[in-house]
Interface confidence: medium
């Protein structure tokens, strides 16, 4: 006959929270401190994530679910699980391997993150230039030329300077 | 979760052609410079590639000037690496890998095998 | 030849302590982060290290990267079986405009 599985192995009558204890003739302990199991029927509790340095924690640890962490202001996440921290730029700039440097002319960032990205092309809809875009924001396109009354008139862009490259990232 | 999906590599004859895609999902694309890292069998690791966010800036090992050309489909989220006059000492695992701003391989993808014989 | 310079193996018991060193030039190490991978057979390389000293959580803090100059080192302690694997350093280059990384070593826990 075929026996169930708790008749084969004890350890999987292990809760959350608890570990199989195989110095105890296989009883369910509870997890020590600073460690936690997931699921039931480990034979280990897995040490708790320490958010330390940059990191800081988002959520302690319990003896059923790990730690998270978040990053420090100034910073924030990337990889699986907030697993690095990468540092906030001002806005009008992005993060290159060098370090925060400013976005290039033609080019703007209104997030503390991310990279800087190419002003819209206002005259691609057949628009224009309502407001100049800077280093931190995008330009504001309006009505077309020819929808414009008598008399009015538009903002027009600079033409677009060339400035040397920024290292690359 | 982050995938990087490598396809194309296979057997190709000295001085022929072949072109590496790498499906990434996951993650917003055409935020993030993408790279090309190369391992000859029993060999370390060399750096093959990477290209700009937009593709405006691409740089390029020593191995891979003017024989090698990356670029990127950032609507169809496809990295790709178009090989010509391939040699045997092309014969390597291709791996496509994110590059996060900070200048590290976090994530990479398992890998396609190029094998230049003839 | 690699840019970069790695000793090819290393090797230490198990609970020891072990430096693999990685050494460059003013154009990548000595102005530039470097980088610390670490491959197993048949499977990509896994960050192990980044900006010189900064682990990704995850990495066990028996690992740690220290930069000095144009020279860094990875250090591993409280060595264990499941650590033997082939490490990798890296950095950007600033002449060649491109990464460059070590040859690799190959340590072996005995």
């Known amino acids: 006959f075929e026996r169930t599985r708790s008749l084969q192995d004890p350890c999987s009558n292990c809760p959350a929270g608890t570990f199989c204890d195989n110095n105890r003739n296989q009883i369910c302990s509870p997890c020590p401190p600073n460690s936690f199991s997931s699921a039931g029927g480990q034979r280990t509790c897995d040490i708790c994530r320490q958010c330390k340095g940059v990191f800081r924690t988002r959520k302690e640890c319990s003896s059923t679910s790990n730690a998270e962490c978040d990053c420090t202001p100034g910073f924030h996440c990337l990889g699986a699980g907030c697993s690095m921290c990468e540092q906030d730029c001002k806005q009008g700039q992005e993060l290159t391997k060098k370090g925060c440097k400013d976005c290039c002319f033609g080019t703007f960032n209104d997030q503390k993150r991310g990279i800087c990205r190419p002003w819209t092309n206002c005259s691609l809809d057949g628009k224009s230039v309502l407001v100049n875009g800077t280093k931190e924001r995008d330009v504001v396109c309006g009505p077309s030329p020819a929808d414009l009354s008598p008399g009015a008139s538009s903002v027009t862009p600079p033409a677009p300077a060339r400035e040397p490259g920024h290292s690359p990232q | 979760e982050v995938q990087l999906l490598e396809s194309g590599g296979g057997l190709v004859q000295p001085g022929g052609s072949l072109r590496l895609s790498c499906a990434a999902s996951g993650f917003t694309f055409s935020d993030y410079y993408m790279s090309w890292v190369r391992q000859a069998p029993g060999k370390g690791l060399e750096w093959v590639a990477n290209?700009?966010?937009?593709?405006?800036?691409?740089y390029y090992g020593d191995s891979a000037t003017g024989r090698f050309t990356i670029s990127r489909d950032n609507s169809k989220n496809t990295l790709y690496l178009q090989m010509n006059s391939l040699r045997a000492e092309d014969t390597a695992v291709y791996y496509c890998?994110?590059?996060?701003?900070?200048?590290?391989?976090?994530?990479w993808g398992q890998g396609t095998l190029v094998t230049v014989s003839s | 030849q690699s840019v970069l310079t790695q000793p090819p193996s290393a090797s230490g018991t198990p609970g020891q302590r072990v430096t693999i060193s990685c050494s460059g030039s003013?154009?990548?190490?000595?102005?530039?982060?470097v980088y610390w991978y670490q491959q197993l057979p048949g499977t990509a390389p896994k960050l192990l290290i980044y900006k010189n000293n900064q682990r990704p959580s995850g990495v066990p803090d028996r690992f740690s990267g220290s930069k000095s100059g144009t020279s860094a080192s990875l250090a591993i302690s409280g060595l264990r079986s499941e650590d033997e694997a082939d490490y990798y350093c890296a950095a950007w280059d600033d002449s060649l405009n491109g990464q460059v990384f070590g040859g690799g070593t190959k340590l072996t826990v005995l």
């Open positions: 290209i700009k966010q937009d593709g405006s800036e691409k």
């Open positions: 890998a994110k590059e996060e701003r900070i200048g590290t391989y976090y994530y």
């Open positions: 003013s154009f990548n190490i000595g102005s530039n982060y």
